[in-house]
């Protein structure tokens, strides 16, 4: 019997120090480039090998970045978000949302607070 897939959403503050080749990741999203339907948020699409983010180890592909150095990333054009990262300075503080896939019990068993009912 197949299990039901749910998601555990957590938030984390990640402080990165810009390396010789920068922060070392790619982003998708923005009001003009929605990656997730009905969500103009900014998502991590690539972690570059041996870059600052990869060496730190906490930022993951698929994470949603909520803010950079305290500046909210809501309702930004894609290029404006890119520019914000590029101009963020040497020490960069990211507020990120991790979405971890978790396997629950068999289909048909709904736990408390399950939105699918």
């Amino acid at each position: 019997m197949n299990g039901r897939v749910d998601y555990l959403v957590t938030e984390e503050e990640i402080n990165l120090t810009r390396g010789p080749s920068g922060l070392g990741f790619n982003i998708v999203g923005g009001t003009d480039q929605q990656y997730v339907s009905n969500d103009s948020g900014i998502y991590v699409s690539r972690i570059k090998e041996n870059g600052a983010a990869a060496l730190d180890g906490r930022l993951q592909e698929g994470d949603k970045i909520l803010s950079v150095n305290g500046q909210d990333l809501k309702n930004l054009l894609h290029q404006d978000a890119v520019d914000l990262f590029r101009n963020a300075g040497y020490a960069v503080s990211l507020r990120v949302q991790h979405r971890l896939q978790v396997q629950n019990g068999p289909i048909g068993h709904r736990g408390e607070g399950d939105p699918s009912g």
Epitope: V44, K48, Q79
Partner: nanobody
């Protein structure tokens, strides 16, 4: 991690056509830039064609322009390389490649400079 499985290679006569397919799994395909590389006997592995995650930007090696077409089907998690007017010098092992798409937060890079994060096992194309 991303798993890439190529298919569609084979033996074809000069002037003929082949269509290579690469099925991807392991993470959302729609956020991946995809590419095709080839390694000819005794040569380096070269980028042949790339397509970005949105499908609106492509790159081709000069020697295949007008003959090869790269395309993607996000619903099927697959990238294709349509190869027409094949020549004996197109004989090679063809590899599917993938990397996370989007914009680098550090600097621009040329779409032809395709640093792959993931590779397929390759499929042999022989043009006689």
């Amino acid at each position: 991690d991303v798993q890439l499985v190529e298919s569609g290679g084979g033996l074809v006569q000069a002037g003929g056509s082949l269509r290579l397919s690469c099925a991807a799994s392991g993470r959302p395909f729609s956020s991946l830039d995809m590419g095709w590389f080839r390694q000819r006997p005794g040569k380096e592995r070269d980028v042949v064609a790339t397509i970005n995650w949105t499908g609106d930007s492509t790159y081709y090696l000069d020697s295949v322009k007008g003959r090869f077409t790269i395309s993607r089907d996000n619903a099927k998690n697959t990238v294709f390389l349509q190869m027409n007017s094949l020549k004996p010098e197109d004989t090679a092992v063809y590899y599917c490649a993938a990397r996370g798409g989007g914009s680098s937060v550090d600097s621009e890079y040329d779409v032809g400079e395709f640093e792959s994060d993931y590779w397929g096992q390759g499929t042999q194309v022989t043009v006689s």
